[in-house]
């Protein structure tokens, strides 16, 4: 078939890095600059990504391949191949409409992306807060409150080892 | 071809004002939202602020007050009033198109002048 093919189709012949020029006889012509073919046997050449503004090349583009991009300092990749740059808030806060924010009382975010998240609730699985949380920080939970009664011991004992009621023989 | 490029930029004293434009072609420029970023020697690129293409506006906390964009659909331009200069607002100053319209989020479409010098000092 690929022999078949490339007798139809002279311009399977063509590598990557090049095109198939209808205008000069379906001659493999290299890209032009500042654009690339990445796979055999295309009709035009591809324009490079530029990385401007906000964007950093990471790569640059060949003949053969796009260019890729990060973002600079104080930014952050989102998106496949870092197709949008966010800005980075400091940890304690959320990037809003209207820029960063400090996290709302009740909300932490310890990265400098992302969104605020409530504090755990301690009491959902019958536990007491040992240390308070903060707008970088999540709650920590301890031992619920009934182990922390007067007498109760911070250690749960072992689970008897006959059933309870019956008397030992 | 899309261009943007920027003017205005310069010398001047603390407490002095300057006006940035960009003149933009090749693209709808009446229905583009604009932004305004900038980036200090040694320091984080940050945005400056922001246009709609109906005109609403947002700023930055540290220049909120100072300064002032604007658009001329009929001139294709955008513009940075900018007021009450400090020190630190010395900066490459950047216009760019603005697609995702979400603050602080440019995207691989956007496009990019290449830049004025602000620097303000006595």
């Known amino acids: 078939f690929e022999r078949t093919r490339s007798l139809q189709d002279p311009c399977s012949n063509c590598p990557a890095g090049t095109f198939c020029d209808n205008n000069r006889n379906q001659i493999c012509s290299p890209c032009p600059p500042n654009s690339f073919s990445s796979a055999g046997g295309q009709r035009t050449c591809d324009i490079c990504r530029q990385c401007k503004g906000v964007f950093r090349t990471r790569k640059e583009c060949s003949s053969t391949s796009n260019a890729e991009c990060d973002c600079t300092p104080g930014f952050h990749c989102l998106g496949a191949g870092c197709s949008m740059c966010e800005q980075d808030c400091k940890q304690g806060q959320e990037l809003t409409k209207k820029g960063c924010k400090d996290c709302c009382f009740g909300t932490f975010n310890d990265q400098k992306r992302g969104i605020c998240r409530p504090w755990t609730n301690c009491s959902l699985d019958g536990k007491s807060v040992l240390v308070n949380g903060t707008k970088e920080r999540d709650v920590v939970c301890g031992p619920s409150p009934a182990d922390l009664s007067p007498g109760a011991s911070s250690v749960t004992p072992p689970a008897p080892a006959r059933e309870p009621g019956h008397s030992p023989q | 071809q899309v261009q943007l490029v920027e003017s205005g930029g310069g010398l001047v004293q603390p407490g002095g004002s300057l006006r940035l434009s960009c003149a933009a072609s090749g693209f709808t420029f009446s229905s583009s939202a604009m932004s305004w970023a900038r980036q200090a020697p040694g320091k984080d690129f940050e945005w400056v602020s922001y246009?709609?293409?109906?005109?609403?506006?947002y700023y930055a906390d540290s220049v909120k007050g100072r300064f002032t964009i604007s658009r001329d659909n009929a001139k294709n331009t955008v513009y940075l009033q900018m007021n009450s200069l400090k020190p630190e607002d010395t900066a490459v100053y950047y216009c760019a198109t603005w697609h995702t319209l979400r603050v602080g989020v440019w995207d691989e479409y956007d496009y990019w002048g290449q830049g004025t010098q602000v620097t303000v000092s006595s």
């Open positions: 246009i709609y293409s109906d005109g609403n506006t």
